[in-house]
């Protein structure tokens, strides 16, 4: 019978008695930076080339005995998970292993750096097809390791890493905290986050998605036909490396940004029990479990978007938080969130020739998050239109006035400490979908984009009585690009996108009187690209 | 996922003009920074990655490494260049006493220095 983990990542249309999805990643080379491996294991024999690269520290302790099977156990298992004949994800992928971890599974940042450099030099000397680099390791936050990962990613290499097994914020570890790396947390057969001893999988905004990582059957270095169950975020990362190899084999021209967006898009949504995570991390942690796409082609027509959370701003009065999209992505909207509700909104601003999303803390606030909606929109030309505070009773409004530009997101930012205590909120006049409306004391920012075939529409869901959460979702075929709250009153904690749903959070109902100010409206901007759909049909 | 994350210790050693009369002294006002792992048991003091500014060529990296060795020797310290980086990041890996950090941070082209640390199988 098919192991649970392979079943979990396989879309129903592939599921038969045997796990045999089309094309097993044969055009892709996967580099594994790990322990030594047993390359003659029947699972991986002929699939893994052991390079001559080795950079490991001495083993700790005077009584440590090097036992070949122990030295090879981690790397052999992971190689099997990626490309093993019986229990592998991408059975056609070829692999190259570099030894950066010793027999105790310990390495150094410097050894890992030299390994990454080795891969880059190999790539330059002998360019091959798409490259995936699997980093099933973690150390403390390292600026230099993150920088090296960034450089390698910008050279067109897909890096996949373990989130870490420390039951902690993945942003405190490297390479997990590197934005360019695909960071993977671990879940079990019950879609619960994995517990490992007293600890478990890492979580938080630096995790891109989760994958099977508990009780994973794979090649054992005990003998050439042995199997063993191992667990950890390394195993989860190996699944994603395998899925990435499959996707890149089907579409070798995919960029890192496109691959990441597809991984997110085809993941199982909202299946993880979030109660396992610390309360303050639940909103930041993606509820996504990796899966193979249902077919290898035909995803190109979709408008892909993802949500990127910033680091926490900190509590000082003028503190700000910045969320950035990847170089190949467009920032289509910007929102903010504060657990205390004390914030001064958000704005999109240019930084180094690219738009970023900046959120502003307010006096007495515990800090804010900026939330960017980052999308793949080829040939896009986006700009931000700003209207200063109107001071008029009708409130502030701004629209996309350029021909062919459509509204993809609305942001509002205010200087006053407590918006909404002065005047009742204003609501958008109906029939004007291409404009953002906000409080009269706020400046309003409209994200306006022109792209071939791009069309957008506004969808609202209002609740007259106070409610802790109001949501509105885009329908099938449309993608959420913008998420904001109407009105920008003081009891709104903020707005953010979860997959294709716009979520507006308010203060605890018990602390909010059921006045008219209790009314909260979630505003979603839903877009699609007719151009991408046509291009896809022409290809087929 | 950002580079500004919190629990990461940063030690900024401001540059002062000293007796070393460097041929390629850093531009006035720039400060190279020193970083080390926030998790103390994972630190590996005595080995440092010296990262140079982005456009630094391999020959400049080698020259900077040699200059560090020469200046350290003048102070009676032994250093060993373990690796010179090029291809991904310009810089070098050096085994040296932590006493030399202030000196190393003043070298030309230096962007930052990071103390080596452990990574673990997950």
């Amino acid at each position: 019978s098919i192991p649970w983990n392979l079943e979990r990542i396989t879309p129903p249309r592939y599921r038969a008695d045997e796990y045999q999805p089309p094309d097993g990643g044969s055009l892709v080379e996967v580099y594994l930076l790990d322990t030594s491996i047993q390359s003659d294991h029947r699972e991986i024999e002929g699939r893994v080339m052991v390079t001559d690269f080795e950079n490991v520290p001495e083993e700790d302790g005077t009584r440590f005995h090097r036992q070949a099977s122990k030295c090879d156990s981690h790397g052999t298992h992971l190689a099997g998970v990626v490309s093993g004949r019986d229990a592998g994800v991408a059975k056609g992928a070829s692999m190259r292993s570099l030894r950066v971890l010793n027999c105790q599974g310990k390495g150094t940042v410097s050894g890992t750096l030299i390994g990454l450099e080795f891969i880059r030099k190999s790539q330059l000397v002998q360019p091959v097809g798409p490259l995936v680099v699997l980093l099933p390791l973690a150390g403390g936050y390292s600026r230099v390791l993150n920088a090296a990962c960034q450089r390698l990613a910008r050279a067109g290499v897909v890096l996949v890493t373990a989130a870490g097994n420390f039951r902690d914020d993945a942003c405190l570890y490297s390479p997990a905290s590197a934005p360019e790396v695909i960071t993977v947390g671990a879940t079990n057969a019950q879609d619960q986050p994995v517990t490992l001893g007293t600890l478990g999988t890492n979580f938080g905004r630096c995790v891109d998605l989760f994958a099977p990582g508990e009780d994973i059957i794979g090649a054992s270095s005990d003998c050439s036909t042995c199997f063993v169950s191992q667990s950890g975020t390394s195993q989860a990362a190996a699944h994603v490396a395998g899925i990435a190899a499959m996707m890149l084999s089907a579409e070798p021209e995919l960029t890192l940004a496109e691959l990441r967006q597809r991984l997110i898009h085809f993941s199982a949504k909202d299946v993880i029990n979030e109660a396992w995570f610390p309360e303050d991390q639940r909103v930041l942690t993606p509820n996504l479990v990796a899966a193979l796409p249902p077919s290898t082609h035909g995803a190109g027509w979709q408008l892909f978007c993802r949500t990127v959370w910033s680091a926490h701003s900190g509590p000082t009065r003028m503190a700000t938080a910045v969320a950035r999209c990847a170089p190949d992505e467009e920032l289509l909207s910007c929102s903010s969130f504060s657990r205390s509700g004390k914030r001064r909104g958000e704005r999109m601003e240019a930084q180094g020739g690219k738009l970023v999303c900046r959120a502003h803390n307010a006096f007495g606030g515990e800090g804010v998050y900026a939330i960017a909606r980052c999308c793949l929109l080829p040939q896009a030309n986006c700009s931000v239109h700003t209207a200063p505070p109107a001071e008029a009773s009708m409130g502030t409004r701004v629209h996309c006035h350029q021909q062919g530009h459509v509204l993809t997101g609305c942001s509002s930012h205010w200087e006053v400490e407590d918006l909404g205590t002065h005047k009742p909120p204003v609501l958008r006049p109906r029939g004007q979908p291409n404009q953002c409306v906000g409080h009269r004391e706020a400046s309003i920012h409209a994200s306006c984009c022109h792209a071939p075939g791009l069309e957008c529409k506004v969808k609202e869901h209002g609740i007259p009585a106070p409610q802790e959460q109001v949501t509105v979702a885009c329908e099938e075929g449309w993608t959420l690009t913008g998420c904001s709250a109407l009105p920008g009153t003081s009891h709104v904690l903020g707005a953010y996108a979860v997959d294709n749903t716009c979520v507006v959070r308010s203060r605890d109902v018990s602390t909010t009187g059921s006045t008219s100010e209790g009314a909260v409206t979630a505003v979603a901007i839903c877009c699609r690209s007719r151009h991408l759909a046509q291009a896809s049909q022409e290809l087929q | 996922q950002e580079d500004e994350d919190g629990d990461y210790e940063e030690l900024v050693l401001a540059l002062r003009s000293e007796e070393d009369g460097l041929a390629e002294a850093p531009e006035h006002g720039t400060t190279a920074t020193f970083h080390r792992c926030a998790k103390d048991p994972w630190r590996l003091p005595g080995t440092y990655v010296v990262v140079l500014k982005e456009e630094t060529h391999l020959s400049q990296s080698e020259r900077t490494a040699r200059r560090l060795q020469a200046q350290a020797a003048r102070r009676g310290y032994l250093t060993k260049i373990l690796h010179v980086f090029h291809g991904l990041l310009p810089g070098f890996l050096v085994k040296m006493s932590g006493d030399l950090l202030e000196l190393a941070l003043k070298l030309p082209h230096v962007d930052y220095i990071e103390e080596d640390s452990s990574v673990f199988a997950q």
């Epitope: 019978s1 192991p3 700790d60 122990k70 156990s73 981690h74 019986d86 229990a87 105790q104 599974g105 310990k106 097994n165 490992l196 001893g197 600890l199 508990e214 009780d215 994973i216 059957i217 054992s220 005990d222 003998c223 036909t225 042995c226 199997f227 063993v228 169950s229 191992q230 667990s231 950890g232 390394s234 | 452990s118 673990f120 199988a121 997950q122």
Partner: antibody, heavy 130, light 107 residues
Framework: EVQLVESGGGLVQPGGSLRLSCAAS????????MSWVRQAPGKGLEWVAN????????YYVDSVKGRFTISRDIAKNSLYLQMNSLRAEDTAVYYC???????????????????????WGQGTTVTVSS | DIQMTQSPSTLSASVGDRVTITCRAS??????LAWYQQKPGKAPKLLIY???SLESGVPSRFSGSGSGTEFTLTISSLQPDDFATYYC?????????FGQGTKLEIK
């Protein structure tokens, strides 16, 4: 679905020998430790022995040490219990069971996490009597 | 060797009752304890592992707690299918021992 099927039980005289077999299906067999557990008539469960995936480590309850030998054949997906010098008190239903557990790394140490015996055979009866 | 003592040996209860079975270890076993259910003529079935983790497919009315030397299995609302014998089992460096069992019968 993993299935375990025991065979080889029967009536044997004290001092005699018997070899129990347990046939398993799928690669999951070779991925876990395996155990033999017995249950004397009207009594509780008693763990007898277990064996590592590759057969390199074996453990026994004190009462059978030196008399019973656990082994496995990965190629045949089979587990065995060779029982020698049988005594009347060895009379029981013998179950083979899969010891589900997993290995994981944490800061340079390789650890084992045990879940329990999650798959059991239907049992085979051994009667030791003259 | 570690001894496991279950109490009570027999427990009479009715459908809908909340019942608790206790298991004591002769020395600390951390959380390395599993609970099994066995019906006459059948093989045991794993219910709980690592003291409190519910095995896949087991109804949520079953729960486990405890660590060190004292452990409990609780059935929040007895169903007709729950009348059986229950065993605890400790795991300690690859050798195991079971408790003597608790027979849960209809009152």
């Amino acid at each position: 679905e993993v299935q375990l099927v025991e065979s080889g039980g029967g009536l044997v005289q004290p001092g005699g020998s018997l070899r129990l077999s347990c046939a398993a299906s799928g690669i999951t067999f070779s991925s876990y430790w395996m155990s033999w557990v017995r249950q004397a008539p009207g009594k509780g469960l008693e763990w007898v022995a277990n064996i590592k995936q590759d057969g390199s480590e074996k453990y026994y309850v004190d009462s059978v040490k030196g008399r019973f030998t656990i082994s496995r054949d990965i190629a045949k997906n089979s587990l065995y219990l060779q029982m020698n010098s049988l005594r009347a008190e060895d009379t029981a239903v013998y179950y083979c069971a899969r010891d589900r557990g997993t290995y994981y790394y944490q800061q340079g140490s390789y650890n084992y996490y045990y879940y329990g015996m999650d798959v059991w055979g239907q049992g085979t009866t051994v009667t030791v009597s003259s | 060797d570690i001894q496991m003592t279950q109490s009570p040996s027999t427990l009479s209860a009715s459908v809908g009752d909340r019942v608790t079975i206790t298991c004591r270890a002769s020395q600390s076993i951390s959380s390395w304890l599993a609970w099994y259910q066995q019906k006459p003529g059948k093989a045991p079935k794993l219910l709980i592992y690592k003291a409190s983790s519910l095995e896949s497919g087991v109804p949520s009315r079953f729960s486990g707690s405890g660590s060190g030397t004292e452990f409990t299995l609780t059935i929040s609302s007895l169903q007709p299918d729950d009348f059986a014998t229950y065993y605890c089992q400790q795991y300690n460096s690859y050798s195991y021992t079971f408790g003597q069992g608790t027979k849960l019968e209809i009152k």
